[in-house]
Amino acid sequence: IWELKKDVYVVELDWYPDAPGEMVVLTCDTPEEDGITWTLDQSSEVLGSGKTLTIQVKEFGDAGQYTCHKGGEVLSHSLLLLHKKEDGIWSTDILKDQKEPKNKTFLRCEAKNYSGRFTCWWLTTISTDLTFSVKSSRGSSDPQGVTCGAATLSAERVRGDNKEYEYSVECQEDSACPAAEESLPIEVMVDAVHKLKYENYTSSFFIRDIIKPDPPKNLQLKPLKNSRQVEVSWEYPDTWSTPHSYFSLTFCVQVQGKSKREKKDRVFTDKTSATVICRKNASISVRAQDRYYSSSWSEWASVPCS
């Protein structure tokens, strides 16, 4: 058993039929010594008396809010949550496996630049009685500070018969050095509580591996005289790290016909312009990637040819 927060305890249980469970001793937070009784949740059934209560925790029915009373007055509450371990593996019932980039990916994170700011998100089908708490650091043995905000519901989607809820959190490394070579990874830890079930999820990454630039901005076409060619120009996204001479991007320019089956013409360039042939009803799209490190491509920025 360990304390998650003040008065909230997590009981770690091996989850199998007829498991012995864990013995837990609760102490009433009061200077009183006599006449103390204990109840669980909304029940008025007295579980025991005295300043301490000893219970055997085996199942969810044994978890919950234990309250000590004296003479009809509530003295204090303690909450017991369960963390299940089945066949040596901690349960992952609360979050959905996103399966990208690999199986057992529950947390996904992205950064728009090298400033030390990043966003993580996760999915669940649970809509109520759900709480998340996020902590982060760089390194684990001698951790350096990373500050995360509150996790918030960022999207709701319908997937077949189920609703899926996306939560996200923004974090910022306290003393980020954008130009430095990373040697220790960022660690992100998410505590999830659903009703009386506790689970924790972790992710470890280097900022350089989760970089995904915003799409190029100000995408414009300039027809070339007496030609089917156009000059496409764009700019670095505002959110990209500066100076651009050091934090450089490379770009992919694509000409795509109206039909998805039509052949795509692609040009790769380090410049912020390119000359392409603009076919009727086609569109021109540009995306960006870190020039010196193969992290994710940005989403496409697009304009119609006409």
Epitope: D7, V8, A150
Partner: nanobody
Amino acid sequence: EVQLVESGGGLVQAGGSRRVSCAASGLTFSDYSMAWFRQAPGKEREFVAAHAWLASTTDYADSVKGRFTISRDNAKNTVYLQMNSLKPEDTAAYYCAAGQRYLSRVSQGYEYWGQGTQVTVSS
């Protein structure tokens, strides 16, 4: 610097309703349990209601159970107390408090306090 600012107090007739709010700043709101206490003239400060940092986890004093509802909006860093079927004995200064304990009914369980908002119930 942590600040808790209550608002919404005022004069209300017996049987009426009122909602008081408490806006928090300078703390990671979602990590804190929030509570309302009240103090009537010449009386001790007493616990009214608490909402833990855990979703949907609340506690109420017997005197307000069924009439008052505490709720919180983590996105707005705000906790609310909806007071219905008000009685003259509910007249008091209402104080908002924030603490890291799960659900405490004692003032020592809360590290931060607001300045209070006065609710007066006339008969």
